[in-house]
Interface confidence: low
Amino acid sequence: MVPPPENVRMNSVNFKNILQWESPAFAKGNLTFTAQYLSYRIFQDKCMNTTLTECDFSSLSKYGDHTLRVRAEFADEHSDWVNITFCPVDDTIIGPPGMQVEVLADSLHMRFLAPKIENEYETWTMKNVYNSWTYNVQYWKNGTDEKFQITPQYDFEVLRNLEPWTTYCVQVRGFLPDRNKAGEWSEPVCEQTTHDETVPS
């Protein structure tokens, strides 16, 4: 009897959908695996007789529930199927956006770049899939614990009237208000403001 794959899970970030599993202990030899997805009541092969312990399902439609399954095989024997269900638009993890930060005197000028969708055309981003896409920005004075959050209306934001010659750190994430779903925070970017540009009286 061939044991089934273990710890079967979907690792999906920005619609790069990788079904992953672990090979069970099997004394007779090396196992291979076949992974399939359900397409209108018929299971279609995606990865056949692979020695890998993952299979790329990024070409699935982003909408709707998908049934995926994987089994282990050895010679003419095979394990039972292990099934999981997966809805990309609901389940994919929203990766961190990109961010460009520029210091202009006592202001930080930020521009945000929605994460690109993996395995798609160059111009496609997560913003194109989710109509309610917005950004959360978190900033703080370097070395302090107090953080401030804002929700920019656009793909850019300016933090004005900051303390001069002070280092501020900023990070951004995608947020979907209609789903109450937040993405991963970007790595903090820390920049030092320069002088206050106000003209003395």
Epitope: Y40, K46, S59, L60, S61, K62, Y63, G64
Partner: nanobody
Framework: QVQLQESGGGSVQVGGSLRLSCAAS????????MGWFRQAPGKEREGVAT???????RYADSVKGRFTISKDNAKNTLYLQMHSLKPEDTAMYYC???????????????????WGQGTQVTVSS
Amino acid sequence: QVQLQESGGGSVQVGGSLRLSCAASGYTYSNYCMGWFRQAPGKEREGVATIDGDGSTRYADSVKGRFTISKDNAKNTLYLQMHSLKPEDTAMYYCAADFALCDPTVVAHTDFGYWGQGTQVTVSS
């Protein structure tokens, strides 16, 4: 919201031709995967043809050499030119679109995000 509206269906004699159209609205990208599907009475819906954003096409074996899928990005319209029609081509034909690359491992999978209402094609002898 993406909307798809098919037209061009009708009745035709065996060996005849028809051209189906699918007008798409609600998005500006030409990079959608689009496809034609059909469903005959009492049968499963099946893929007929798909076309990718770059224009690459795939066909079901049953229509290869007879049907041609194409699109006009400027008009946001998808077409299916059907020649040498057979009685077994009789079905409701649906246009579908999805914000994804067409799946290269199957001719036309049916897990598309957006669907039209369909247009009837009847081939009689």
